[in-house]
Interface confidence: medium
């Protein structure tokens, strides 16, 4: 068991169950969206060319005003604009990202993990997740904010195997499980009931959860405890 | 006049059609490149300002191994003798941990366990050698001169090392270098 003393602070900040975890926005989504746009554009183009061929003879025979041609030009114009916007997006966004990265003071190289290149170098990868193994002590609330600022969430433990692994890595840390009071159930950050045993749950002052050597325990939310962050790949 | 207008609209629509096609092919190429980049660059950047390592060769670790700084580590929870540990690592196409520096296992620095590492005494070279034959740096473990040369070395990731009988059973760490 980790025998490091837990520092209790006077300020016991209760967890805020309403706080929404921000999900990191990957490049993949925008590219998939663009891919859908292309499919949509292709369909429209085919439909437009079919209309053009189908109506060609009729309008020429009757020598009528060129409403269909205007329509086709309009459709083609819109498609062109969409395609141009897509091209600009793909060209501009990565370069602005790189620009932003270059301006950064944090020069972190990224390690490729299971699907190559998902975690920054100072994070570890294990079983399709990235973990930030913190060394700083924070309150539960501060830890939550620290992980959010890293575009990740306070350590969640999905199964017993993960808990065993994390206990090897670090004997003690906050986890993303809390309750509003001792009369309320333990819940995870996404509001689901946490069904595993949390030690010392009968103490009304201990409403945030800690992983401590293969064990889940309750602790005072205002205590300063090491925190870890996690992001699933 | 109507014929002229029709021809003009056809010309415009034809031009737009060509532009559309060229834009589509450009988009296709850009997308292809983006997907190629995606396999190199991370989809997730756990921090707002992170420079990406584009041309790294380090890639995936086996299931249940830990990836850290382009190395893969297997951290056992089972205790084995030094020789058993060495063979188990070899069977996983890896070797018992060889340390570059004492902060290599920085992510485990709060661990209280000692683990067998790939260090043993060579009578032939009268020196402590790593499994790959390289000599132990005198700066890595200041206390190494007091190690019993008949023993094997167990290491705690906070930087401590001790010598123990090679027949003792300890946890062990295997390491695979990816680059």
């Amino acid at each position: 068991m980790d025998n490091q003393g837990v520092i209790y602070s006077d300020l016991n900040l209760p967890p805020n169950p309403k706080r929404q975890q921000r999900k990191p926005k990957g490049n993949k989504n925008s590219i998939l969206a663009t891919e859908q746009e292309i499919t949509y554009a292709e369909l429209n183009l085919q439909k437009a060319s079919q209309d053009f061929q189908g109506n060609d003879k009729t309008y020429h025979c009757k020598d009528l005003p060129s409403a269909p041609e205007k329509l086709i030009v309009g459709i083609l114009g819109i498609i062109c604009l969409i395609l141009m916007a897509s091209v600009v997006t793909i060209v501009v966004i990565p370069s602005t990202l790189i620009q932003r990265h270059n301006n950064s003071s944090l020069n972190t190289r990224t390690q490729k993990a299971r699907h190559c290149g998902h975690c920054p170098e100072e994070w570890i990868t294990y079983s399709n997740s990235c973990y930030y193994i913190g060394k700083e002590r924070r309150t539960w609330e501060e830890s939550l904010l620290a992980c959010t600022s890293k575009n990740s969430s306070l350590l969640s433990i999905d199964n017993e195997e993960e808990m065993k692994f994390l206990s090897i890595i670090s004997p003690s840390s906050w986890i993303g499980v809390f309750r509003n009071s001792s009369h309320h159930p333990w819940v995870t950050m996404n509001g689901l009931a946490f069904k595993h045993e949390i030690k010392d749950s009968d103490n009304a002052e201990l409403n945030c959860a800690v992983l401590q050597v293969n064990r889940l325990k309750s602790a005072q939310c205002g205590s300063s405890i090491i925190y870890h962050c996690k992001h699933k790949l | 006049m109507a014929v002229f207008k029709t021809t003009l609209w056809r010309l415009i629509s034809g031009t737009l059609g060509i532009i559309c096609l060229s834009l589509m092919s450009t988009l296709g190429i850009l997308l292809k490149n983006s997907f190629t980049k995606l396999s190199i660059e991370p989809a997730f950047t756990p921090g707002p300002n992170i420079e990406l390592q584009k041309d790294s060769d380090c890639c995936s670790c086996q299931e249940k191994w830990v990836g850290y700084r382009c190395n893969c580590y297997f951290i056992s929870s089972e205790q084995k003798t030094w020789n058993e540990s060495r063979h188990l690592c070899a069977s996983q196409k890896s070797s018992l941990l060889q340390l570059q520096n004492t902060d290599e296992l920085d992510f485990m620095s709060s661990s209280q366990q000692f683990y067998w590492i790939g260090l043993s005494y060579s009578e032939e070279h009268t020196a402590w050698l790593w499994e790959n034959g390289s000599a132990l740096s005198q700066y890595l473990f200041p206390s190494f001169e007091t190690f019993n040369t008949k023993n094997c070395i167990a290491y705690n990731p906070n930087g401590n090392a001790l010598d123990e009988s090679c027949e003792d059973k300890n946890r062990y760490i295997c390491k695979q270098q990816l680059i």
Epitope: M1, D2, N3, N159, E160, E161, M163, K164, S167, P171, K195, H196, E197, K199, V213, N214, R215, L216 | E63, K64, S77, E78, Q79, Q112, Q113, R171
Partner: antibody, heavy 118, light 107 residues
């Protein structure tokens, strides 16, 4: 209510094989590591083998390594112990035991007797 | 493997007595130690885990202490139903091991 019920024991000749089963109910079987522990007549407890919740981690005591195989079927809520090349010293009551997320064995079966004798 | 040595191997005591059983590990196991009670013909029952945490439903007369290599199980006031065999077990690392047991008999 958590229940663990062992079956498949009996008398077997040295060198023979036997397959023990443990049927689990009253809890989410797929979330727990499971273990086999045995107790020779009039002797103490001896841990035999462990299997983690999704079978990623499997461990054996040196005395049974290479002869016994632990497995589980989460869909059937069942734990198994395939025992081959049985010896007289394997005679014991075999218990299956549940772990609660790294806690020691909080629930045990009633035990099943395995006798290895010619 | 981590060896656990229990002492005494057996002891006689009377109802109301305070009893202490010790368990020594061959190497440090932080506090990854459990205590079990077993009665004849029955499966063992978990009493204490993490060296000192009482499992819910277990009477408070049972308590555990210690860390590292030396651990103790204390029964503050023996009751008739407490006469049984007690085992310590380490769950720090595999292979998991048990102590050889301490038989507690009525004097």
């Amino acid at each position: 209510e958590v229940q663990l019920v062992e079956s498949g024991g009996g008398l077997v000749k040295p060198g023979g094989s036997l397959r023990l089963s443990c049927a689990a109910s009253g809890f989410t079987f797929s979330s727990h590591s499971m273990n086999w522990v045995r107790q020779a007549p009039g002797k103490g407890l001896e841990w035999v083998s462990a299997i983690s919740s999704s079978s990623s981690y499997i461990y054996y005591a040196d005395s049974v390594k290479g002869r016994f195989t632990i497995s589980r079927d989460n869909a059937k809520n069942s734990l198994y112990l395939q025992m081959n090349s049985l010896r007289a010293e394997d005679t014991a009551v075999y218990y299956c035991a549940r772990e609660e997320w790294g806690l020691p064995f909080d629930y045990w079966g009633q035990g099943i007797l395995v006798t290895v004798s010619s | 493997a981590i060896q656990l040595t229990q002492s005494p191997s057996s002891l006689s005591a009377s109802v109301g007595d305070r009893v202490t059983i010790t368990c020594r590990a061959s190497q440090g196991i932080p506090s990854a130690l459990a205590w079990y009670q077993q009665k004849p013909g029955k499966a063992p029952k978990l009493l204490i885990y993490d060296a000192s945490s009482l499992k819910s439903g277990v009477p408070s007369r049972f308590s555990g202490s210690g860390s590292g290599t030396d651990f103790t199980l204390t029964i503050s006031s023996l009751q008739p139903e407490d006469f049984a065999t007690y085992y310590c077990q380490q769950f720090n690392s595999y292979p998991l091991t048990f102590g050889q047991g301490t038989r507690l008999e009525i004097k």
